[in-house]
C-alpha cells in the first residue's frame, strides 16, 4: 500500500526557518504534490505549495521556496511569520497524486522538542485520507 | 504595464449562455492564478472561481460550479469564463482579477482587476 | 463558507480625520502568525482596487495614511487623515479556506 512522509524540520543555521518535507513510497508516477497548512488540502487546510513534475511549482506566502528532492519526495521552505515560536503546533499537510493509485495525504508537524539539525530521518506516518 | 482588457457587454436571454474573456498584458499569465469575481447591482462582491493557467488548474465556489466554466488560452495570454443556464439573478458585472505574485510566491489578493464586463438577463 | 461581516455598513468622516473600518470573520483566517486578510476600495464605476494584503501589508502605490491591523477573527481597516479622494466602498476578503469571500462593504462618505 503506497504511504506518505511528512517531516518538519528547523533549521540549525537559522532558528527561525522551517522546511517541509514530504515523501510517497509506492509505485507508479506522481502527477501532482499539494502542500497546505492548517488542515489537509479541501479540508480546511490553506495551500502553501503545488508542485507539477513537468509544469512546474506554484507558491503561496510564506513558503519561500518549493522543490522537488527525488522524483517521489518534495521539500519546502518556509519564511519566519514573525511569532514569536513560529510554526510550532501548526500541522502541514502534504498530498501526492499518483497515477494508477490516486490520491494519498498525510500530516505532520514539527516535534515538540526538536533541536535544530537533529530531527530523525523521514518515517512514513498514518495515512490521513486516500481518495 | 499590467493590464486585464475584458470583453464588451453582453445582453443575453434567459437559459442561454455567454463566454466572457480576459486578456492579459504586462506579465505572464502562467506565473499567477486568475480569477473571476461577481458583482451585483447594489450588492457586495462574489467569488466565482479561478484558473492557474500553467497547469490548467481550476477552483470553483460550489454555488458557481454547475453554471461556470474558467479556461485559459496561454498562448494568447487569455482567460475566458462561460456561464451557462443564465437567469435574471445573474445580471451583474464579472471581473476578472489576478492574484498577486511577487518574486515567484503567490499571495491569495487579488491586485489587478478588469475593467469588468456587464451580463444582463432578459427576455 | 467562512462569513466576514463588516462594521459599521456606512461611514461618515470629516476630512482630515480618522475613518475605522471592522471586519469580523465567522471562524479564525488566522495560521501561525499569517492571516489570510485583504482590503480592497471600490469606486463607483471602477474595480475593486487592492490596498492591503495578508491583513497589515500595504500594497505597492498605495497611500501610507492607509494601515490594516488584527488577527484570528477581528481586523480593522484605518485611514488617517481621510483625504476627499478616500471616498468610497471597503471590502474585506479572506483566503484561508476556500470558497474566498468577500465582507458586505462598508460606504465611506467625507464631509
Known amino acids: 500500500t503506497p504511504e506518505v512522509w511528512v517531516q518538519v524540520q528547523m533549521e540549525a543555521t537559522e532558528l527561525s526557518s522551517f522546511t517541509v518535507h514530504c515523501g510517497f513510497l509506492g509505485p507508479g508516477s506522481i502527477s501532482l504534490v499539494t502542500v497546505s497548512w492548517g488542515g489537509p488540502d479541501g479540508a480546511g487546510g490553506t495551500k502553501l505549495a503545488v508542485l507539477h513534475p513537468e509544469l512546474g511549482t506554484r507558491q503561496w506566502a510564506p513558503a519561500r521556496q518549493a522543490r522537488w528532492e527525488t522524483q517521489s519526495s518534495i521539500s519546502l521552505a518556509l519564511e519566519d511569520s514573525g511569532a514569536s515560536s513560529p510554526f510550532a503546533n501548526t500541522t502541514f499537510c502534504c498530498k501526492f497524486a499518483s497515477f494508477p493509485e490516486g490520491s494519498w495525504e498525510s500530516c505532520g508537524s514539527l516535534p515538540p522538542s526538536s533541536d535544530p539539525g537533529l530531527s530523525a530521518p523521514p518515517t512514513p506516518v498514518p495515512i490521513l485520507r486516500a481518495d | 504595464e499590467v493590464q486585464l482588457q475584458q470583453s464588451g457587454a453582453e445582453l443575453v436571454k434567459p437559459g442561454a449562455s455567454v463566454k466572457l474573456s480576459c486578456t492579459a498584458s504586462g506579465f505572464n499569465i502562467e506565473d499567477t492564478y486568475i480569477h473571476w469575481v461577481k458583482r451585483r447591482p447594489e450588492q457586495g462582491l462574489e467569488w466565482i472561481g479561478g484558473?492557474?493557467?500553467?497547469?490548467?488548474?481550476?477552483l470553483y465556489a460550489s454555488k458557481f460550479q454547475d453554471m461556470a466554466t474558467i479556461t485559459a488560452d496561454t498562448s494568447s495570454s487569455t482567460a475566458y469564463m462561460q456561464l451557462s443556464s443564465l437567469t435574471s439573478g445573474d445580471t451583474a458585472v464579472y471581473y476578472c482579477?489576478?492574484?498577486?505574485?511577487?518574486?515567484?510566491?503567490?499571495?491569495?489578493?487579488?491586485?489587478?482587476w478588469g475593467q469588468g464586463t456587464s451580463v444582463t438577463v432578459s427576455s | 463558507d467562512i462569513v466576514l461581516t463588516q462594521s459599521p455598513a456606512s461611514l461618515v468622516v470629516s476630512l482630515g480625520q480618522r475613518a475605522t473600518i471592522s471586519c469580523r470573520a465567522s471562524k479564525s483566517v488566522s495560521i501561525s502568525g499569517y492571516s489570510y486578510m485583504h482590503w480592497y476600495q471600490q469606486k463607483p464605476g471602477q474595480p475593486p482596487k487592492l490596498l492591503i494584503y495578508l491583513a497589515s501589508n500595504l500594497e505597492s502605490g498605495v497611500p501610507a495614511r492607509f494601515s490594516g491591523s488584527g488577527s484570528g477573527t477581528d481586523f480593522t481597516l484605518n485611514i488617517h487623515p481621510v483625504e476627499a479622494e478616500d471616498a468610497a466602498t471597503y471590502y474585506c476578503?479572506?483566503?484561508?479556506?476556500?470558497?474566498?469571500?468577500f465582507g458586505g462593504g462598508t460606504n465611506l462618505e467625507i464631509k
Open positions: 484558473i492557474d493557467p500553467a497547469i490548467g488548474n481550476t
Open positions: 476578503q479572506h483566503s484561508r479556506e476556500l470558497p474566498p469571500t
Open positions: 482579477a489576478r492574484e498577486r505574485v511577487y518574486s515567484n510566491t503567490l499571495y491569495y489578493a487579488m491586485d489587478y
